[in-house]
């Protein structure tokens, strides 16, 4: 940048110096020097002179024509060709920056992390508007109709000390720039319904040497939340496949879930929990990996065809991952949900 | 009720500096986010800067670079420091609440006049 250049003359931006990417831009020089009478007026854009669409205007003036200006930013500075002088003579310089007003935000989340301390707020942005573009974080009370805001730039932490007079707030996103102002649409929170539970960990995992191998994993997390409904995914390493089972957990000791799956085999977990009723999950717990002991019967035991856990899980279902090489990142795609029966002898292979 | 009372405006040469007050009340100062504002003559009301109850700024892109915000929550009051001041900041300067727009509340304000 060049804020604080010495000029000897001005030059000056039309419609401004931060416009609309794509708009035509007119920028005009106007020297002041003494003891020159210029023979020629010279523009630069980062540092090139510039050969085409110049305009001397008069003795002292010249304008370079930009046509559907598209870079986000640019250096402009114009210079002199003064008589006996060897070298041209700077005259000013100006930064420019093209860009787009900001979309609407869209998607707003808020959150509160258990034991944090924070309410957290996130939402899309949406397109790049390359230019210097802030958030203002409206939280109104809908009990004492108070108004705090705070400024962001793509995501908002407040403390709940903060948000003491009342539990029901209106939550709004102010996107706003020097081309525009955009609002986002208003979420209606309750302080009570927006908690993400401690999170949860996968602590170990061992799988039995019965004749029908069991694998026992074990589960635990710091929450004082009573009611806390959880899945566990899990697939071997090398399928694309989750099985999701469901539990309702109860954190005061350490959970146990148990599954038959097929021996010899890497498989991964990953557990992640919401308070029973809400929306708001935990992300993923780190993948936990586990070998499963080989073979020791005959019978190729079917992970689907045998008892299911002795807790209250009652669904599983199979999503496909995007990329088994990055379990922490792999979406729902879709979901193909059966429920589990105990098994009574009849071994049903489910598909 | 609230009050705001803005203070520190003059008569100062261009390229010189100045430093604005505003002194609040009859609400709970640190938790609110702030703004300056402006009405220069014959023109309508600019929006200046904004400070929220956390100190983060937000500045018009004509001051970006000249003026900063900054509010003392132990005095309940809020600041402008208006340096290599120009021709056209001559204005008068008000205080409000909240971060962003250009409306104030309807308190006296202080002239800043900037001329050689």
């Known amino acids: 940048g060049i804020t604080s250049i010495n000029c000897s003359g001005d030059m000056w931006v039309e419609p401004g110096e931060i416009f609309q990417m794509g708009m035509n831009v007119s920028i005009y020089c106007q020297e002041a020097l003494k003891h020159c009478r210029p023979r020629n007026l010279y523009f630069y854009k980062n540092g090139f002179k510039e050969e085409f669409d110049i305009t001397r205007i008069n003795r002292t003036t010249a304008r370079i024509w930009y046509k559907g200006f598209s870079e986000p930013h640019a250096y402009m500075h114009c210079t002199a060709e003064c008589p006996g002088h060897f070298q041209e003579t700077l005259i000013c310089g100006k930064d420019i920056s093209s860009g787009h007003p900001p979309d609407a935000p869209s998607n707003l989340t808020c959150v509160i992390y258990e034991y944090s301390g924070n309410m957290t707020c996130t939402w899309n942005t949406g397109k790049p508007t390359y230019i210097d573009t802030k958030y203002i974080v409206h939280v109104k009370s809908l009990e004492t109709e108070e108004e705090q805001q705070y400024l962001a730039s793509s995501y908002v932490k407040i403390s709940t000390d903060s948000l003491q007079g009342s539990r029901k707030y209106l939550v709004w996103v102010q996107a706003v720039n020097s081309l525009g102002m955009e609002n986002s649409q208003q979420l209606h929170v309750h302080l009570d319904d927006i908690v993400i539970p401690s999170a949860s960990i996968i602590s170990r995992a061992e799988t039995t040497n019965d004749t029908v191998p069991k694998t026992i994993v074990y589960w635990k997390s710091k929450t004082m939340i009573e009611k806390v409904f959880c899945e566990m995914r899990y697939k071997t390493t090398t399928n694309q496949t989750w099985s999701v089972k469901e539990f309702d957990a109860n954190f005061t000791y350490v959970q146990q879930s148990e599954f038959y799956l097929e021996p010899d085999s890497k498989y991964v977990f990953q557990v992640r929990c919401q308070e029973t009723g809400k929306r708001n999950w935990q992300p993923w717990s780190s993948p936990f990996v586990h070998q499963t002991s080989q073979e020791t019967g005959k019978r190729n035991w079917q992970p689907w065809s045998s008892p299911f856990v002795h807790q209250t899980s009652q669904t599983v279902s199979q999503v496909t991952a995007k990329s088994s090489h990055e379990p922490q990142k792999m979406e729902m795609l879709s979901a193909t949900i059966f429920r589990g029966h105990p098994a009574s002898g009849n071994h049903q292979d489910i598909g | 009720q609230v009050q705001l009372q803005e203070s520190g405006g003059g008569l100062v040469q261009p390229g010189g500096s100045l430093r604005l007050s505003c002194a609040a009340s009859g609400f709970t100062f640190r938790l609110t986010a702030m703004r300056w504002v402006r009405q220069a003559p014959g023109k309508g009301l600019e929006w200046v800067s904004g400070i929220d109850s956390r100190g983060s700024t937000i500045y018009a892109d004509s001051v970006k670079g000249r003026f900063t915000i900054s509010k003392d929550n132990a005095k309940n009051t809020l600041y402008l420091q208006l340096n290599s001041l120009k021709s056209e900041d001559t204005a008068m300067y008000y205080c409000?609440?909240?971060?962003?727009?250009?409306?104030?509340?309807g308190s006296q304000g202080t002239q800043v006049t900037v001329s050689s």
């Open positions: 409000a609440q909240g971060v962003y727009g250009d409306t104030y509340s």
